[in-house]
């Protein structure tokens, strides 16, 4: 492994559709894969009237947007489906939402970021 890179070998698995898909609902998924591909963990969830509903969690294959992310953090502002990915074993056990603030001219009333959601 390259020095400083956190190798992903397993991720927390969750599937809200587990009955239809005939899988277990939750567990640990081994992230097998091509040697020249990086492996990540991911989480997707929805915020339904302030309540967090996990959609899926598991392994995620070679995605440049996930490189070198040690924490699973969604940065998009108010998506319908929240998504985060990260590198490191079980790094998707906890996930959070920190929307990146748009860079605007400073005002007398600074905007505080929305609080994160954690699993």
């Amino acid at each position: 492994a390259i020095l400083g890179r956190s190798e992903t070998q397993e991720c927390l698995f969750f599937n809200a559709n587990w009955e239809k898909d005939r899988t277990n609902q939750t567990g640990v998924e081994p992230c097998y894969g091509d040697k020249d591909k990086r492996r990540h963990c991911f989480a997707t969830w929805k915020n339904i009237s302030g309540s967090i509903e996990i959609v899926k969690q598991g392994c995620w294959l070679d995605d440049i947007n996930c490189y070198d992310r040690t924490d699973c953090v969604e940065k998009k502002d108010s998506p319908e489906v929240y998504f985060c990915c990260c590198e490191g074993n079980m790094c998707n056990e906890k996930f959070s939402y920190f929307p990146e603030m748009e860079v605007t001219q400073p005002t007398s009333n600074p905007v505080t970021p929305k609080p994160p959601y954690y699993n």
């Epitope: 698995f13 005939r22 894969g33 929805k46 899926k56 598991g58 995620w60 294959l61 489906v81 998504f83």
Partner: antibody
């Protein structure tokens, strides 16, 4: 990179079984991934048929469950499709394809496809 | 099963145009939507996954968007090599299902 190649007879008689092989290079089918068969009917409609996973477990399209079997030969790094009791409706181009993880279902690797005609 | 509908089966555009191809799912698929390109020789390639993420090696003129049941693929500055049929596919619930395809032709 992973490469897939389909092979098998191009013509099958009605009521007989259709058998195809997918040969995989660049990756061991027991090391990971889900190894799928997908077919494309005349007119372009694509249908996912089923998979065999790296650990040998199967999942099939309910529409085919009574006729389909997907098996493998790990020593040859191949997996197989067997479709029983075919009719002319099974005439299609058959692709093998793979995806990586249970909740990451993007078919990143495809074979070039093989046309199978069902005709007397 | 989740039905995937591409209402436009073929469309004509000029080189340099911006083209949008739509796909609708019969139920919410939570952004687990992929796009594929099939060239006239039958070769199939993954373009976009999870609604908007570009597969490695795919030109940046391809982009995807959508949520819930409605999704789209956009090609900006259409090139000759983009002439192909485009399929959407849902990866949210088994059995995995595909749209009927949209054939892109040059005017």
């Amino acid at each position: 990179d992973v490469q897939l190649q389909e092979s098998g007879p191009g013509l099958v008689k009605p009521s007989q079984s259709l058998s195809l092989t997918c040969s995989v290079t660049g990756y061991s089918i027991t090391s990971g991934y889900y190894w799928n068969w997908i077919r494309q009917f005349p007119g372009n409609k694509l249908e996912w048929m089923g998979y065999i996973s790296y650990d040998g477990s199967n999942n099939y399209n309910p529409s085919l469950i009574n006729r389909i079997s997907i098996t493998r030969d790990t020593s040859k790094n191949q997996f197989f499709l067997k479709l029983n009791s075919v009719t002319t409706e099974d005439t299609a181009t058959y692709f093998c394809a793979s995806y990586a993880y249970r909740n990451d279902v993007r078919f990143a690797y495809w074979g070039q496809g093989t046309l199978v005609t069902v005709s007397a | 099963d989740i039905q995937m509908t591409q209402t436009t089966s073929s469309l004509s555009a000029s080189l340099g145009d911006r083209v949008t191809i739509s796909c609708r799912a019969s139920q919410d698929i939570s952004n687990f939507l992929n796009w594929y390109q099939q060239k006239p020789d039958g070769t199939v390639k993954l373009l976009i996954y999870f609604t908007s993420r570009l597969h490695s090696g795919v030109p940046s003129r391809f982009s995807g968007s959508g949520s819930g049941t409605d999704y789209s693929l956009t090609i900006t500055n259409l090139e000759q090599e983009d002439i192909a049929t485009y399929f959407c596919q849902q990866g949210n619930t088994l059995p995995w299902t595909f749209g009927g395809g949209t054939k892109l032709e040059i005017k």
